[in-house]
Interface confidence: low
């Protein structure tokens, strides 16, 4: 199989761009940063550095639609009913894909066409107030190279590893888009 | 109280099709995936097939791959199995089960149907 | 994908423990925590026991344990109860999207 020097994408047959990325969120005036993490119990929530748990790959499923997973919960980011999200193993068209925008700002919006809702960190009580409101805190993300080592995959879902600081390297994450930095890596994720 | 009934079992020679049928109730059923069980006669547990909640994404064994077809049917609260180019090794009860949500993990099972596949 | 290998019969006398393995590979039980057991009456339809290696669903008795060590998954039963005489089997999620079952434990209770 080759791969493409594009940029940091894994392919597989279908030729179809795999991003591995931190996705970075903050609160309101900078203050509780954090990185979306998908937990092997299927809880999603913040690491406040970046973690093995927080390295994701973005996959477009469809014109500026994307599926998110966790590389080492393997699980997919989903959204339920409510706006809450959920780390899945099974992945689904309704639940798990996320119309992508890309904001002037360099951050990133993920809207469950669905739900019509942006995937959010925020808490039950906050995606209430939103619905009153107009924007929901968490759920601007800005996406970051990793930089951190990947754990041997037989402590797959075992550990909350240390915190790791790191610059903040982004790119846009447009999916048909030519993006550098970060050599192709093989996953067995998004195998089909 | 979740029931999952399953309807459409019976013998069939080897090469040819049957549709098994699973009529659910008592859960909102297009917010669950589902799958499709087997067990042949005195042997193990093998899963067949999944489909999500809304019917977009499937999944299947490799055994069963390009034979098989699950599909759903959220406004009859019904699930299927279209079975094609039928082998004696798929002689097996299928069980419908229902997924806890989307995890491959099954919270309730029916009972069962009987396919023989015979000649 | 092969099947999971489990014992196929495993014996204990009531109020003892006994442990059923179940041993798959690095795609499998050894790569993700997505273990599960069933337990099966005859005639009857299988019941979830143990999911995600070692968590127990409400209403499951907690003489029901679970582990996980490399590429063997156990499930361990303790005080056996006459009750508990049934087939078990394990399932993990797969590299492939897809669950494989092991060939089944017959539990006799002596």
């Known amino acids: 199989l080759a791969f493409s020097d594009a940029g940091p994408h894994v392919h597989y047959g279908w030729g179809d761009p795999i991003r591995l990325r931190h996705l970075y969120t903050s609160g309101p005036h900078g203050l509780s940063s954090c990185f979306l993490r998908i937990r092997a119990d299927g809880v999603v929530d913040c690491a406040r550095g970046q973690s093995a748990h927080s390295l994701l790959e973005i996959k477009a499923v469809a014109l500026r639609t994307v599926a998110i997973k966790g590389v080492h919960s393997v699980r997919y980011l989903c959204m339920g009913a409510d706006g809450k999200m959920q780390g899945l193993l099974q992945y689904s068209e309704e639940d798990c894909a996320f119309e992508e925008e890309i904001r002037p700002d360099g951050y990133n919006v993920y809207r469950s066409e669905k739900h019509r809702l942006p995937v959010s960190l925020s808490s039950a009580k906050q995606r209430q107030l939103y619905k009153n409101r107009g924007f929901l805190p968490l759920s601007h993300f800005l996406p970051m190279l990793p930089m951190v080592p990947e754990e041997p995959e037989d402590l797959r879902g075992h550990l909350e590893s240390d915190m790791f600081s790191s610059p903040l390297e982004t790119d846009s994450m447009d999916p048909f888009g030519l993006v550098t930095g970060l050599e192709a890596v093989r996953s067995p994720s998004f195998e089909k | 109280e979740v029931q999952l009934l399953e309807t459409g079992g019976g013998l069939v020679q080897p090469g040819g099709s049957l549709r098994l049928s699973c009529a659910a109730s008592?859960?909102?059923?297009?917010?669950?995936?589902m799958s499709w069980v087997r067990q042949a006669p005195g042997k193990g547990l093998e899963w067949v097939s999944a489909?999500?909640?809304?019917?977009?994404?499937?999944y299947y064994a490799d055994s069963v791959k390009g034979r098989f077809t699950i599909s759903r049917d959220n406004s009859k609260n019904t699930l299927y199995l279209q079975m094609n180019s039928l082998r004696a090794e798929d002689t097996a009860v299928y069980y419908c089960?229902?997924?806890?949500?989307?995890?491959?993990?099954?919270?309730?099972w029916g009972q069962g149907t009987l396919v023989t596949v015979s000649s | 994908q092969a099947g999971l290998t489990q014992p196929a019969s495993v014996s204990g006398s009531p109020g003892q423990s006994i442990t059923i393995s179940c041993t798959g590979t690095?795609?499998?039980?050894?790569?993700?925590?997505?273990v599960s057991w069933y337990q099966q009456h005859p005639g009857k339809a299988p019941k979830l026991m143990i999911y995600?290696?070692?968590n127990r669903p409400s209403g499951v008795s907690d003489r029901f344990s679970g582990s996980k060590s490399g590429n063997t998954a156990s499930l361990t039963i303790s005080g056996l109860q006459t009750e508990d005489e049934a087939d078990y089997y394990c399932?993990?999620?797969?590299?492939?999207?897809?669950?494989?079952f092991g060939g089944g434990t017959q539990l006799t209770v002596l």
């Open positions: 089960a229902k997924d806890v949500w989307q995890e491959l993990l099954f919270d309730y």
């Open positions: 008592g859960f909102t059923f297009s917010s669950y995936a």
């Open positions: 489909i999500s909640g809304s019917g977009g994404s499937t």
């Open positions: 690095s795609s499998d039980v050894g790569g993700y925590n997505y």
């Open positions: 995600d290696v070692s």
């Open positions: 399932s993990s999620y797969t590299r492939s999207s897809t669950l494989v």
